[in-house]
Each structure stands twice: as C-alpha cells, then as structure tokens.
C-alpha cells in the first residue's frame, strides 16, 4: 500500500469533532475498464443524436476526468443527413458518486459527491403543448 | 461526529499492507437529490430507440438499486410509429463509482467499485460490412 | 426474509417527544436507507424522512424538519423515529419501511402513537 | 411536493370484476410511481413498483401502466382478498402518497 505523509492541516480520523468517517479502499475492482467514451464506441458520431464529449478535469475529484456529453443539434438527423426539428436530441442524464478532496489538495481525505452528468444524447418526440 | 466501536477482524488505516485507503466524510453534498432530473424525465417512452428499465439489486452496495436500460427493439421508432431495421437502438453506457462493503459487515470499511451500466439508448446508423 | 420490528404503542403529552424503534432481524440494515411514515386515524400515508444506516444520511420532509429526528444503530440494526413538541394532530399509526430510494418493499407493523391531555 | 391525485376515492365491485384505479401527479415524474395495498390494521405492502414492474410475489392479476403524469392500476378479475385501500405514491422528488382508493364489495 501507498503511505501518505501527513498533512498537519488534514483532518485525523481519530478527531471526534470530524463529520462521520470512514476509510475507503481505493484498489477499484474493475479497474482496467475504458474511461475514454470515444474509444469504446462511436456511438456519439454515428446516432441521429449525435453528441460532441467533453473532457471535465478537477485534480480534486476522483474520478478527476469526467467525460460530458453536449447534444450537437437541438433536432435530429433524419435520412437525408439534415436535422430534423420536428424532433428534439436531449441528454441522458445519469446520477454518479464521485469523491471530492476536502480539505482540497489533502491527499486523503475526501467528502462523497454525487453529481449528475450527461452521458450521451437520443432524439425523442417532442411534448406539444396545446394552447387553451 | 459518530464514533464507531472497532472490530478487530477490520482493517485498520494505518496498516502498511491495506492497500491505498483514504478518508471519506459522508456527509454527502447533495444529499437530496429527488429533485434532479434523472428521475423525471419520460425519454425511454419518447425516444425513438425506447427502452425499458430493469431493477439491478444488491444490498452489499450503495446504491443498492441500479437501473439498467435494456433497448425495446434492434431497430429504432420511425415517423410512422413503426420499426425501422435499416437502423439500430443501442444501449448508451456509463461506468459508475459504488461502495461496497468490505470486509463485509464491517461498518466504516468500504471498497470502491467500478461497475458498467446501461443508462438509455440512442438510434444510430448500422456499420455495413461489404463482402469482398 | 427481512423484517422490520417496531417498539410497542405509546401515550404521550402534548408538548413532549416520543422515540419509535425499528429493529431490522434476518440480516443486517445492508445498504437501503429506512424511511418513517405515518397515518392519522382514517387518513392517508404521510412521508416524514429516511437514513440511510451506511452512512447516517439523512433526508426530512420539509413538513417535519425541526421536530423530527431519525438515527440509527448499526450494531444493533436498530432505527429510530424522535418526535418533539407533541401536539394531538400527531395521533397516527408511525411505520418503518425498508426504502431503496425508489420504493418501500418491506414494512414494520406499525405503532400507534396517542397525544392526549 | 409533488401532489398525487387519485380517482375514484372508493369503488364498489363484485369478485371477477375489472377494476381500474388512476392516479395523476401534479407534475411530470417519469416512471417513478408504486403502487401499494393496505388492509384494516396492516401495514402497506408493495404491489407495483417503477409504473409497471410486479413486485415479486404479487398476482399477476394486479398490473400498472402510465408515463409521465398519469398512472392507472388495474386488477383483471377481483378476487376476495382484494378488498382493501389502495395508494399510489411517487419517487420523482421527496415522497408523496395519494389520498388512497377504497375497493368495497358492493
């Protein structure tokens, strides 16, 4: 295992005024997953939702690159190639845990996150709103 | 803070051979989080590449129910409400963070794991492999 | 098969505080969160909070914030439910469920709670 | 919060019939609506969860449906042991039940 020196201004998990701690373990099972969308599939290129990926970088969160998807078009590409209005892309959107370093830059010690993020875009039918 | 008894068949943080363990504060930023939008949107109906939505369940992790996305039809929804199979509903994945407890039963003693899931589909056109 | 076991009924004075258990037996807490819900005499189900015993997060409706505190012990799979400043509309059956987040599968029997002068 | 609207608040009904029960929240909550019986001094139990899913165990007579803002449960043939209170509740944000829907025998 990794040995960290400590950092006198980095919380001790013995301190009792300390919110609820515990230790994780970070050796991840499954580790040698792909973490670069654009390797593992062409999808974001090749749907009629296309989407354009977002590198999103914080040294103080692991996961500390997280990819973000945009949808390129407010419509959808239809058989010609064009894009399509009557339909609309959208992002779907998916709730992750994240760490986050707290205090920032003490190597270990960190606060659960969750964050929301956009994982890729489909093209749904759009809600009409009738007007009374 | 909330201190908790130690079991002496868990692993202790300052032990060289536990592999990188860090603290984790959980108490959670965005704890609440009903109100985001991965619970209230109706896109696996409205999609032209629907999906339905299976229940993934384990009580050793958190979160201990995960939605897995499973694609309604090989081909995508077409203006007429029909299926088209010049094109193809794939599934968009996402590899998330889960704890998990370990050694199990140990109660400030997690491991992270990273798992693969299925967040929604999207339509794309289908690679044509051309015979030589 | 989990299931929930909740302390006995309980009279009580307006203006003090009740605390509700709920013991989990056949297995521990694991990672689900235990939510409190309530039902007046003849009323609807009312949501009052959840924790999740992992990790003692806790969420409370907007209804019950101040009064109403929920713990949890994990050595003994054991959540409570702690209701103050008692008044006679909090007269209800009180129950625990087990809450993945997204639905309540499993449930306590329920305790009746009586504020009454 | 998210109110849920049930309708009708009770029905009378004979064993075998088909009952529907609908159920509308104020706002859009995806699939995130369960479905639950009570019977007189019991506690709920889960029948529906996610708008469509059995919960295990539960007669495949029971079943839902619905996206969005309007839910319906439907019990196929009714049987005895389905006289109860039933309530719709939603997920989508902090919880929130429906004011319930009593079947009786009529």
């Known amino acids: 295992g990794i040995t960290i020196p400590r950092n006198p201004g980095c919380p001790n998990s013995e301190d009792k005024n300390f919110p609820r701690t515990v230790m994780v373990n970070l050796n991840i099972h499954n580790r040698n997953t792909n973490t670069n969308p654009k390797r593992s599939s062409d999808y974001y290129n090749r749907s009629t939702s296309p989407w354009n990926l977002h590198r999103n970088e914080d040294p103080e969160r692991y996961p500390s690159v997280i990819w973000e998807a945009q949808c390129r078009h407010l419509g959808c590409i239809n058989a010609d190639g064009n894009v399509d209005y009557h339909m609309n892309s959208v992002p779907i959107q998916q709730e992750i845990l994240v760490l986050r370093r707290e205090p920032p830059h003490c190597p270990n010690s960190f606060r659960l996150e969750k964050i929301l993020v956009s994982v890729g875009c489909t093209c749904v039918t759009p809600i009409v709103h009738h007007v009374q | 803070g909330i201190t908790i008894p130690r079991n002496p068949g868990c692993p202790n943080s300052e032990d060289k051979n536990f592999p990188r363990t860090v603290m984790v504060n959980l108490n959670i930023h965005n704890r609440n989080t009903n109100t985001n939008p991965k619970r209230s949107s109706d896109y696996y109906n409205r999609s032209t590449s629907p999906w339905n939505l299976h229940r993934n369940e384990d009580p050793e992790r958190y979160p201990s129910v995960i939605w897995e996305a499973q694609c309604r039809h090989l081909g995508c929804i077409n203006a007429d409400g029909n299926v088209d199979y010049h094109m193809n509903s794939v599934p968009i994945q996402q590899e998330i963070l889960v704890l998990r407890r370990e050694p199990p039963h140990c109660p400030n003693s997690f491991r992270l794991e990273k798992i693969l899931v299925s967040v929604g589909c999207t339509c794309v056109t289908p690679i044509v492999h051309h015979v030589q | 098969q989990v299931q929930l076991v909740q302390s006995g009924a309980e009279v009580k004075k307006p203006g003090s505080s009740v605390k509700v258990s709920c013991k989990a037996s056949g297995g521990t807490f694991s990672s689900y969160a235990i939510s409190w819900v309530r039902q007046a005499p003849g009323q609807g189900l009312e949501w009052m909070g959840s924790i999740i015993p992992w990790f003692g997060w806790t969420n409370y409706a907007q209804k019950f914030q101040g009064r109403v505190t929920i713990t949890a012990d994990e050595s003994t799979s054991t959540a409570y439910m702690e209701l103050s400043s008692l008044r006679s509309e909090d007269t209800a059956v009180y129950y625990c469920?087990?809450?993945?987040?997204?639905?309540?599968?499993?449930w306590g029997q329920g305790t009746l709670v009586t504020v009454s002068s | 919060d998210i109110q849920m609207t049930q309708s009708p608040s009770s029905v009378s009904a004979s064993v075998g019939d088909r009952v529907t029960i609908t159920c509308r929240a104020s706002q859009g909550i995806s699939n995130w609506l369960n479905w639950y019986q009570q019977k007189p001094g019991k506690a709920p139990k889960l029948l529906i969860y996610?708008?469509?899913s059995l919960q295990s165990g539960v007669p495949s007579r029971f079943s839902g449906s619905g996206s969005g803002t309007d839910f319906t449960l439907t019990i196929s043939s009714l049987q005895p042991e389905d006289f109860a209170t039933y309530y719709c509740?939603?997920?989508?944000?902090?919880?929130?039940f429906g004011q319930g829907t009593k079947v009786e025998i009529k």
């Open positions: 996610a708008a469509s």
């Open positions: 469920a087990r809450d993945s987040e997204y639905y309540f599968d499993h």
């Open positions: 509740q939603q997920y989508s944000d902090d919880p929130t």
